[in-house]
Amino acid sequence: CKAMHVAQPAVVLASSRGIASFVCEYASPGKATEVRVTVLRQADSQVTEVCAATYMMGNELTFLDDSICTGTSSGNQVNLTIQGLRAMDTGLYICKVELMYPPPYYLGIGNGTQIYVIDPEPCPDSDF
């Protein structure tokens, strides 16, 4: 089978600071030197791109400076962190992996990680 499979956790709870981390792992059918990782958010059948990065195998994963994502790569595993999340950002976050080079191209799409974000309660006013 030439398909590429992508695994990611089913559920992740964001921290009180609005940070969520999860691992995206792919089973590569070929020996890629250039890989693109994209995080997509699916809500109400609408799909939007959250962030994307292309990296050379063995090198670090670099997102754009203004990206809400950071990540590290190790072999066929990518550790992704999404920051600045609020309750309204709760949704299904899909990891998409593409083996860009050398040919042939392969596409892998995970089943998605449901990220739950709970906005922290505001601190009560203190008398002290």
């Epitope: 089978c1 030439k2 398909a3 590429m4 499979h5 059918p29 250039e34 693109r36 994209t38 997509l40 799909v47 939007t48 791109e49 994307a52 292309t54 899909i94 998409k96 593409e98 860009m100 080079y101 040919p103 042939p104 191209y105 392969y106 596409l107 892998g108 799409i109």
Partner: antibody, heavy 118, light 108 residues
Framework: QVQLVESGGGVVQPGRSLRLSCTAS????????MDWVRQAPGKGLEWVAV????????YYADSVKGRFTISGDSSKNTLYLQMNSLRAEDTAVYYC???????????WGQGTLVTVSS | EIVLTQSPGTLSLSPGERATLSCRAS???????LAWYQQKPGQAPRLLIY???SRATGIPDRFSGSGSGTDFTLTISRLEPEDFAVYYC?????????FGHGTKVDIK
């Protein structure tokens, strides 16, 4: 809304060249793969080429490899297909299409007809 | 390359009937990477289904996709007059991307 408009088709002699354009609007060009697909008269769909994201990675069908070149200009939101050494069997309607974020070609242009004939 | 074989070549049915179209791959295709398109004469194709079973935006629920491995099916539960067209399957999991030769659904 998303729109793709092809241009540049016409009648050309075998061995000559032609450049097709596809102007995109309504989305960020660099976030998507962009493809050319062709359809010979009365026949089915044939994938021709794709260009991804920053434009460094391009792939072609064997039938056009070495003769056709796909390129894009993100500042103009325009996709191109440079077709050289044209043959009679290249006669087709050429469509540009956007690769959907989860796969499949989710938007298509109206197509432009290329006729290769002496 | 992955070869997709569609059957039947032509399907003659009446409005209101159920249409079942088949697409068979020469090697296993992950269900995440199979799409179905509809094309009417003189028009560009339109994406119906991606990921073997997910309906594209604006596609009515009478269209459904299923299957895995090498065998995939597009089902139209009750044919409407506007559904008579040619349908293509496509795999996009690996290059070169390939289409089936199409199934024409015409009015009996």
């Amino acid at each position: 809304q998303v729109q793709l408009v092809e241009s540049g088709g016409g009648v050309v002699q075998p061995g000559r060249s032609l450049r097709l354009s596809c102007t995109a609007s309504g989305f960020t060009f660099s976030s998507y793969g962009m493809d050319w697909v062709r359809q010979a008269p009365g026949k089915g769909l044939e994938w021709v080429a794709v260009i991804w994201y920053d434009g460094r990675n391009k792939y072609y069908a064997d039938s056009v490899k070495g003769r056709f070149t796909i390129s894009g200009d993100s500042s103009k939101n325009t996709l191109y297909l440079q077709m050289n050494s044209l043959r009679a069997e290249d006669t087709a309607v050429y469509y540009c299409a956007r690769g959907g974020l989860l796969g499949g070609f989710d938007y298509w242009g109206q197509g432009t007809l290329v006729t290769v004939s002496s | 390359e992955i070869v997709l074989t569609q059957s039947p070549g032509t399907l003659s049915l009446s409005p209101g009937e159920r249409a079942t179209l088949s697409c068979r791959a020469s090697q296993s295709v992950s269900s995440s990477y199979l799409a179905w398109y509809q094309q009417k004469p003189g028009q560009a194709p339109r994406l119906l289904i991606y990921g073997a079973s997910s309906r594209a935006t604006g596609i009515p629920d009478r269209f459904s996709g299923s299957g895995s491995g090498t065998d995939f099916t597009l089902t139209i539960s009750r044919l409407e007059p506007e559904d008579f067209a040619v349908y293509y399957c496509q795999q996009y999991g690996t290059s070169p991307f390939t289409f089936g030769h199409g199934t024409k659904v015409d009015i009996k």
